[in-house]
């Protein structure tokens, strides 16, 4: 759970869920890009 | 219009686990904050843990730490809570409910778990 | 964790008349993004708990404008402008600031 990451405050981990989410779609946009390129 | 419904009124021996469901529909499930409370009866409310569907991450209630399973299957938008090691005093209410803005918008309709011998 | 108390624990106020519940934090619920996270909720004997207010004195839509909620740091107050009949029901405090997540032990609004 929560990846070894520790917050106190519930509104700081929503921002930490929202900056996986979005690293997550960059990183999954990347992923299709570089399989479509190949 | 967000709606959660849970499973039925369960019995269960000193002991055992039980497993309560809640469906969600009319929203994202997957990019929601599901929580799980408790009320015993006549009493307060007490909160148990969370889920992120999205990444199955979940944050739990020290008071439950180890006791507690919260999952969720996004192919159906069902959120589980599993309580392990019953006692007389997990006779409660459960419920599901959803946050939005940093509060929990909208609620189950409520499970009663007893715990009896 | 953080302590909710709040208080009373039970009210009888007359139809009409206004109804004052107060809740008190062991620590600030002002977060570092600048809300406070301190909710209110209402419920009815067999029902689920219903939100009315959340960031301390937003209502909820829908919720009439006789409820409301002031406070900051560690002190606030639900009030209820003019009590109605429907407005029978016990009230909760919880704070959604820290982990772990938690509740004041409820008031009990009745009719005098």
């Known amino acids: 759970h929560s990846d070894g990451i520790f917050t106190d405050s519930y509104s700081r981990y929503r921002k930490q869920m929202a900056v996986k989410k979005y690293l997550a779609a960059v990183l999954g946009k990347r992923y299709k890009q570089r399989v479509k390129n190949k | 219009e967000v709606q959660l419904v849970q499973s039925g009124a369960e019995v269960k021996k000193p002991g055992s686990s039980v497993k309560v469901s809640c469906k969600a529909s009319?929203?994202?499930?997957?990019?929601?904050?599901m929580h799980w409370v408790r009320q015993a009866p006549g009493q307060g409310l007490e909160w148990m843990g969370l889920?992120?569907?999205?990444?199955?991450?979940?944050r739990y209630a020290q008071k439950f730490q180890g006791r507690v399973t919260i999952t969720a299957d996004e192919s159906t938008s069902t959120a589980y809570m599993e309580l392990s090691s019953l006692r007389s005093e997990d006779t409660a209410v459960y419920y599901c409910?959803?946050?939005?803005?940093?509060?929990?918008?909208?609620w189950g309709q409520g499970t009663l778990v007893t715990v009896s011998s | 964790d953080i302590v909710m108390t709040q208080s009373p624990d039970s009210l009888a106020v007359s139809l009409g008349e206004r109804a004052t519940i107060n809740c008190k934090s062991s620590?600030?619920?002002?977060?570092?993004?600048?809300?406070?996270?301190l909710n209110w909720l209402q419920q009815k004997p067999g029902q689920p708990p219903k939100r009315l207010i959340y960031?301390?004195?937003t209502r909820e839509s829908g919720v009439p404008d006789r409820f409301s909620g002031s406070g900051s740091g560690t002190d606030f107050t639900l009030t209820i402008s003019s009590l109605q009949a429907e407005d029978v029901a016990v009230y909760y405090c919880?704070?959604?600031?820290?982990?772990?997540?938690?509740f004041g032990g409820g008031t009990k609004v009745e009719i005098k």
């Open positions: 009319g929203g994202t499930f997957s990019d929601s904050y």
């Open positions: 919880w704070q959604g600031t820290w982990f772990d997540l938690t």
């Open positions: 960031w301390a004195s």
């Open positions: 889920i992120y569907p999205i990444f199955a991450d979940t």
């Open positions: 409910a959803i946050d939005q803005d940093g509060s929990f918008a909208y």
């Open positions: 620590q600030s619920l002002l977060d570092a993004d600048g809300k406070t996270y």
